[in-house]
């Protein structure tokens, strides 16, 4: 407990060039009689920043009216901050003395430093797509911030990730710093609609972190499953064969039919549908003439997905004598 305390609540004040800085100072007593002055630095070489009684300080204004009775707020604002303004600022109470005022009590000081906001984080994924169950790396970069202390977090669909490495450069003193972080993410089959988020928190952002995102749809390849089936119904002397290509991503797909090893150009119809998880289904129908066919017809549905090696599924056509004899409007 003391007769008078000088309260400077902020140890560190981060300011931006060109902006206005507010330096807070309150006193707990108006006694003893005497002015409150602001200085930058300590000792005999300290620089007078503001004196309420005398001098011309064009960039400095007081937050409160110092002529108001019982005023205990001696905070000041300094406008148009430049790099030359950095340093530690002290509010100092003087008491009236004879013949001149005597320094009575100093505040603990507020260090003014230039702060710079980090740039918006940029998240980059892998150059090539990878299939589920494999691990992919994402990098996040942000630049131009000061001071050096910064926090970076990774999230996948809102869940925080722990497998990442972060570096802040340079390690020594600098006007501005950069951060780079690499996160390792295991892909799940349902990750087409997933997102990874890089979140950067810095003192200059006032509790409102910056976020960068990347869609896992850019990094994942979900290979299709194939199923070839013969439709029980016959249309005249033709049999309908279906090739169902399920759960693939991305959409890029080439489908070809082969009849006993010979590629066929004809394809009756096809449909593309999107699943809830963002993957696609492709259904292709192929009509086979059976009037002049032998019984050993082998149909192959071949799929080339996203530039990968082709996968295929074969079906040996079952054509009974009874089917061959039926008229075109009959139902088998």
């Amino acid at each position: 407990e003391e007769e008078l305390q000088m309260i400077q609540p902020e140890k560190l004040l981060l300011v931006t060039v060109g902006k206005t800085a507010t330096l807070h100072c309150t006193v707990t007593s108006l006694l003893p009689v005497g002015p409150v002055l602001w200085f930058r630095g300590v000792g005999p070489g300290r620089e007078l920043i503001y004196n309420q009684k005398e001098g011309h300080f064009p960039r400095v204004t007081t937050v409160s009216d110092l002529t108001k009775r019982n005023n205990m707020d001696f905070s000041i604002r300094i406008s148009s901050i430049t790099p030359a303004d950095v340093g530690t600022y002290y509010c100092v109470k003087f008491r009236k003395g004879s013949p001149e005022n005597v320094e009575f009590k100093s505040g603990p000081g507020t260090e003014m430093a230039l702060g710079a906001k980090p740039s918006a984080p940029v998240v980059l994924g892998p150059a090539a797509r990878t299939t589920p169950e494999h691990t992919v790396s994402f990098t996040c970069e942000s630049h131009g911030f000061s001071p050096r202390d910064i926090t970076l977090k990774w999230f996948k669909n809102g869940n925080e990730l722990s497998d990442f490495q972060t570096n802040v450069d340079p390690t020594g003193q600098s006007v501005a710093y950069s951060i780079r972080s690499t996160a390792r993410v295991v892909l799940d089959p349902w990750d087409v609609r997933s997102q990874v988020i890089c979140e950067v928190a810095h003192v200059t952002l006032q509790g409102d972190p910056l976020r960068g995102t990347a869609n896992l749809s850019e990094a994942i390849r979900v290979p299709p499953t194939l199923e070839v089936t013969q439709q029980p119904m016959r249309v005249g002397n033709q049999v309908n064969v279906t090739c169902q290509v399920r759960k693939f991503y991305p959409q890029s797909l080439q489908l070809t039919w082969s009849e006993n090893g010979n590629v066929c150009q004809r394809e009756t119809a096809s449909t593309l549908t999107e699943n809830k998880d963002g993957t696609y289904n492709w259904t292709s129908w192929f009509l086979v003439n059976i009037s002049d066919q032998r019984d050993d017809v082998v149909l192959t549905c071949q799929v080339k997905h996203d530039g990968q090696l082709a996968v295929s599924k074969r079906l040996a056509l079952e054509v009974t004598v009874h089917q061959k004899d039926q008229s075109s409007d009959a139902t088998p």
Epitope: E2, E3, Q52, L66, R95, K96
Partner: antibody, heavy 114, light 111 residues
Framework: QVQLQESGPGLVKPSQTLSLTCTVS????????VNWIRQPPGKGLEWIGI???????DYNAALKSRVTISKDTSKNQVFLKLSSVTAADTAVYYC????????WGQGTTVTVSS | DIVLTQSPASLAVSPGQRATITCRAS??????????MHWYQQKPGQPPKPLIY???NLESGVPARFSGSGSGTDFTLTINPVEANDAANYYC?????????FGGGTKVEIK
């Protein structure tokens, strides 16, 4: 709680030095100043001087040549010395805390007489 | 030195009435937006008790019947309503300039 207590000889011979002690409790002498004030019998109050927390002093110019205020922070004591006393220095002597004089001792009576 | 002149020198008031004491300074006691004038109550055989600081601020524990006003050179202590135990000497004091000085006192008696 805050307390101040004056002590010293009740009788001092003329031309001698009056020495009083103010023992304080409930606050620190490094954080607060202590005043000395006196009151001659049946008269008003007269400020003698103050010793601040940093041990600097300010005195009433009318008494400055004869007054010394000092302190021993470790013992929580403030001292008043008034030299070359005369009968006009007969008074109740008070010590009071700080510029606000918010706490006072009970006072000690000093008579200057041969 | 700043001379503080109190008036009246003595005052007799009935309980429930208002008592007004004035203190005039030979020069302004205002500095840095405040009036460095204080009021004390002293009863016989006791040390002064602070009532008002900085012209108008009530010390903690002091009844709201006591109030202070004024600035510059003219100050007033008001007791309203007066009670029997308010009988005492009242002093104004300035600590705007050295030497710090007290007024000559006003004796308040209860009728």
């Amino acid at each position: 709680q805050v307390q101040l207590q004056e002590s010293g000889p009740g009788l001092v011979k003329p031309s001698q030095t009056l020495s009083l002690t103010c023992t304080v409790s409930g606050f620190s002498l490094t954080g607060y100043g202590v005043n000395w004030i006196r009151q001659p019998p049946g008269k008003g109050l007269e400020w003698i001087g103050i010793i601040w927390g940093d041990a600097s002093t300010d005195y009433n110019a009318a008494l400055k040549s004869r007054v010394t205020i000092s302190k021993d922070t470790s013992k929580n004591q403030v001292f008043l010395k008034l030299s070359s006393v005369t009968a006009a220095d007969t008074a109740v002597y008070y010590c009071a805390r700080a510029g606000k004089m918010d706490y006072w001792g009970q006072g000690t009576t000093v008579t200057v007489s041969s | 030195d700043i001379v503080l002149t109190q008036s009246p020198a003595s005052l007799a008031v009935s309980p429930g009435q208002r008592a007004t004491i004035t203190c005039r300074a030979s020069e302004s006691v205002d500095s840095y937006g405040n009036s460095f004038m204080h009021w004390y109550q002293q009863k016989p055989g006791q040390p002064p008790k602070p009532l008002i600081y900085l012209a108008s601020n009530l010390e903690s524990g002091v009844p709201a019947r006591f109030s202070g006003s004024g600035s510059g050179t003219d100050f007033t202590l008001t007791i309203n309503p007066v009670e029997a135990n308010d009988a005492a000497n009242y002093y104004c004091q300035q600590n705007n300039e050295y030497p710090w000085t007290f007024g000559g006192g006003t004796k308040v008696e209860i009728k």
